[in-house]
Interface confidence: medium
């Protein structure tokens, strides 16, 4: 039975040209995390594999940095980066857990962090 929950940074906002850290945390399970995928809609941004390390998709190499931890740093943000981001935890033996983050990239300096929320 899958007992774990994913805690994410929830709904967040950031300024155009700035950077933002996407973070997820898997808790309430002893399952082994074997890979974390970071995806934007249907596009793969990056993966962190337990044995093979990080891989950043070639199309995002200039603007995506691995970490901190299993998180992902997006740089040189544009308004087009607004949207849903997903952390997909592949675990053994539980299977797959998915967390959702919504990022809004703002033109002005009114960006503020939203509240955290959980996805079971």
């Amino acid at each position: 039975m899958m007992t774990g929950t994913i805690e994410t940074t929830g709904n967040i906002s950031a300024e155009k040209g700035g950077s933002i850290i996407l973070q997820c945390h898997l808790s309430s399970t002893t399952a082994q995390v074997t890979q974390v995928n970071w995806e934007q809609q249907d596009q793969l941004l990056a993966i962190c594999n337990a044995d093979l390390g990080w891989h950043i998709s070639p199309s995002f190499k200039d603007r995506v940095a691995p970490g901190p931890g299993l998180g992902l740093t997006l740089q040189s943000l544009t308004v087009n980066d607004t949207g849903e981001y997903f952390c997909i935890y592949h675990t053994y033996p539980d299977g797959t857990y998915t967390g959702r983050i919504f990022l809004e990239v703002l033109e002005s300096s009114v960006a503020e962090h939203g509240a955290r929320f959980q996805i079971p």
Epitope: T34, N37, I47, D51, H55, S57
Partner: antibody
Framework: QVTLKESGPVLVKPTETLTLTCTFS??????????VGWIRQPPGKALEWLAN???????YYNPSLKNRLTISKDTSKSQAVLTMTNMDPVDTATYYC??????????????????WGQGTTVTVSS | DIVMTQSPLSLPVTPGEPASISCRSS???????????LSWYLQKPGQSPQLLIY???NLASGVPDRFSGSGSGTDFTLKISRVEAEDVGVYYC?????????FGQGTKLEIK
């Protein structure tokens, strides 16, 4: 450090079944995208891919040998096992196992058969 | 099956001179994800094969930069800018676009 080592009989009689074990360290077959492949090389000849087994228990076989091959894994022992039935003298070869990351699962090739075992030589003769 | 054809099959080279090996596939190795699944391996005498180059032109970890790979689609080339004695062995190209993964016949590089 990733290492793999093949073990099995040195001599097999025709029609018998060959069982080879690949014992590995430095990676896990619980890890998403990873697998172990088996490759063989008859004396003085080219390499021939035989089979792969993946972290999710998916199996791929060379169609030319599919009805003779079975691949399995014991994740807790960090082992992959290849069995080959109805052995023939033409199956005399050095058999290798190697680590592999599944193509198209985002990996660009740097982990495709990137570390090999030392190989084990199997002779089929009566 | 995808057939991999290498040439030449034998390549005598003087140390310090360049060397070139050709590999042709019977089908394009370009995947829809933009990656070309072509690797080169070197099997030194009495040893297991070792990964030299992946995805046409990327050097595997620890491989000297005198090795280089080029090509696209169905035609690929492995080059050694200056051959050294330690480069002797059999070179194989391999496709892993689809099962069964297939190797070329091998090119034996020897020192003149």
């Amino acid at each position: 450090q990733v290492t793999l080592k093949e073990s099995g009989p040195v001599l097999v009689k025709p029609t018998e079944t060959l069982t080879l074990t690949c014992t590995f360290s430095g990676f896990s077959l619980r890890t998403y995208g990873l697998g172990v492949g088996w490759i063989r090389q008859p004396p003085g000849k080219a390499l021939e891919w035989l089979a792969n087994i993946w972290w999710d228990d998916d199996e791929y076989y060379n169609p030319s040998l599919k009805n003779r091959l079975t691949i399995s894994k014991d994740t807790s022992k960090s082992q992959a096992v290849l069995t080959m039935t109805n052995m023939d003298p033409v199956d005399t070869a050095t058999y290798y196992c190697a680590r592999i990351a599944r193509p198209h699962y985002y990996w660009d090739g740097r982990y495709i058969l990137d570390v090999w075992g030392q190989g084990t030589t199997v002779t089929v003769s009566s | 099956d995808i057939v991999m054809t290498q040439s030449p099959l034998s390549l005598p080279v003087t140390p310090g001179e360049p060397a070139s090996i050709s590999c042709r596939s019977s089908k394009s190795l370009l995947h829809s994800n933009g990656i070309t699944y072509l690797s080169w391996y070197l099997q030194k005498p009495g040893q297991s094969p070792q990964l030299l180059i992946y995805q046409i032109s990327n050097l595997a970890s620890g491989v000297p930069d005198r090795f280089s790979g080029s090509g696209s689609g169905t035609d690929f080339t492995l080059k050694i800018s200056r051959v050294e004695a330690e480069d002797v062995g059999v070179y194989y190209c391999m496709q892993f676009l689809e099962v069964p993964y297939t190797f070329g016949q091998g090119t034996k590089l020897e020192i003149k």
